[in-house]
């Protein structure tokens, strides 16, 4: 990737990622420097007849760093702080080629939950107020609520009225997704409204 347009690479928290390096064809490489946010990560001197010299200069990421045979950077056990700008400089006798990358760390979504604050009106209509959440949600998580294939809400919250006298059994499903994972959780309107009805009759007695 040229330095003008960094290659955006997605990594998953806790997993591994490779930043691919392309070599100038037919040129002898003198050394390669890898940088993270403009700080040196590693300095590599290739040898034709023996193993390359690899000097890891960033102790923080050092134990999680590896290099492929073509000196692409492999980073394992990814952490959120690995997010940022990476650059590789390949120096030959005649030129220096720069490759740029932007690494984005995404979380696998975990622990989807639905909370319910519902009301029963005197006409026996049940108004459902549902809120969907996942652990450590960020701005890259999309939420939506669906029923019978229709999207009823594009937010973590759903407000909907359900009348047991005219509506058949109805499931509402929250779907949370990001670029690397998706989770869903379904709730039954009938069950939720029955629970509210029990509470309602208990308080009336």
């Amino acid at each position: 990737q040229s330095s003008l347009t960094p290659l955006m690479v997605n990594g998953i928290l806790g997993e591994s990622v490779t930043l691919p390096l392309e070599f100038p064809a037919g040129e002898k490489v003198n050394f390669i420097t890898w940088l993270f946010n403009e700080t040196s990560l590693a300095f590599i001197v290739p040898h034709e007849t023996k193993s390359p010299e690899i000097h890891v200069t960033n102790p923080k990421q050092g134990k999680r760093l590896n290099f492929t045979q073509s000196y692409s950077l492999q980073l394992s056990n990814l952490k959120m702080e690995d997010t940022g700008s990476y650059r590789a400089q390949i120096s030959t006798k005649t030129s220096a080629k720069l490759s740029s990358y932007t690494l984005r760390i995404l979380r696998q979504l975990r622990n989807i939950q639905v909370t319910n604050h519902s009301q029963l009106f005197q006409n026996m209509t049940c108004e459902l107020h549902l809120t969907c959440s996942v652990e450590d949600a960020d701005d890259n998580v999309s939420f939506r609520w669906e029923a019978l294939g229709n999207t009823l809400s594009s937010q973590p919250n759903l407000t909907v009225s359900w009348d047991p006298r005219i509506s058949s059994e109805q499931d509402y499903t929250c779907i949370a997704e990001n670029a690397v994972s998706n989770l869903s959780f379904s709730v039954s309107a009938q069950k939720l409204c029955e629970d509210v009805k029990i509470q309602y009759t208990d308080t009336k007695m």
Epitope: L7, M8, V9, N10, T102, R104, D139, N140, S142, R144, W145, E146, T151, L152, S153, S154, Q155, P156, N157, L158, T159, V160, I175, E177, N178, A179
Partner: antibody, heavy 118, light 106 residues
Framework: QIQLVQSGSELKKPGASVKVSCKAS????????MNWVRQAPGQDLEWMGW????????RYADDFKGRFVFSLDKSVNTAYLQISSLKAEDTAVYYC???????????WGQGTTVTVSS | QIVLSQSPATLSLSPGERATMSCRAS?????MHWYQQKPGQAPRPWIY???NLASGVPARFSGSGSGTDYTLTISSLEPEDFAVYYC?????????FGGGTKVEIK
């Protein structure tokens, strides 16, 4: 039917403020996020950010932090975009657009032209 | 942010011809949405989640792709298809649009 109706064109002087409205009808307003999109003359579409119509919490794209404010009046199913300290480069058509999920904008307002000129 | 590059910038074709336009993302995205815009009008939803046609969109339109490469195809151009088509990604904030492909009459 489902629609978003925006307020009319505005001509403003640099440094002034403007408030664009977007009135929703035909659906439960608080169930769908409202996005704002800018299109400068002859330019591409730029996503400005969105507001959660249930909680009222806005989220702004980096280029639109500071002078741009999203707000709601849930009692009249209306979203607002306010721009302060207007500059000539704010001259554009501003669209509101409903998010149907996965940030797919299935319903758009007709657009409000804001012209900033001295 | 994820940059979406659309190509070609302009497609000059005649009615009845096949149109294919590309949208390339600077990073892998899960799905792509497409919108049609005509001069002086708001964009209209056209294709959502890569391959699903929006309500009222004719079957001559199709969408495909995955990862970083997505395509919108019009099998046989009709006069009303001449417009600008924008792709848009949702996988990462900020949501970004491509620069558009203008389909014009040759």
């Amino acid at each position: 039917q489902i629609q978003l109706v925006q307020s009319g064109s505005e001509l403003k002087k640099p440094g002034a403020s403007v408030k664009v409205s977007c009135k929703a009808s035909g659906y439960t307003f608080t169930n769908y996020g409202m996005n704002w999109v800018r299109q400068a003359p002859g330019q591409d579409l730029e996503w400005m950010g969105w507001i959660n119509t249930y909680s009222g919490e806005p989220r702004y794209a980096d280029d639109f932090k500071g002078r741009f404010v999203f707000s709601l009046d849930k009692s009249v199913n209306t979203a607002y975009l306010q721009i302060s300290s207007l500059k000539a480069e704010d001259t554009a058509v501003y669209y509101c657009a409903r998010d149907y999920g996965r940030w797919y904008f299935d319903v758009w307002g007709q657009g409000t032209t804001v012209t900033v000129s001295s | 942010q994820i940059v979406l590059s659309q190509s070609p910038a302009t497609l000059s074709l005649s009615p009845g011809e096949r149109a294919t336009m590309s949208c390339r993302a600077s990073s892998s995205v899960s799905h792509m949405h497409w919108y049609q815009q005509k001069p002086g009008q708001a964009p209209r939803p056209w294709i959502y989640a890569t391959s699903n046609l929006a309500s009222g969109v004719p079957a001559r339109f199709s969408g495909s792709g995955s990862g970083t490469d997505y395509t919108l195809t019009i099998s046989s151009l009709e006069p009303e298809d001449f417009a600008v088509y924008y792709c848009q990604q949702w996988s990462s904030t900020p949501r970004t649009f491509g620069g558009g492909t203008k389909v014009e009459i040759k």
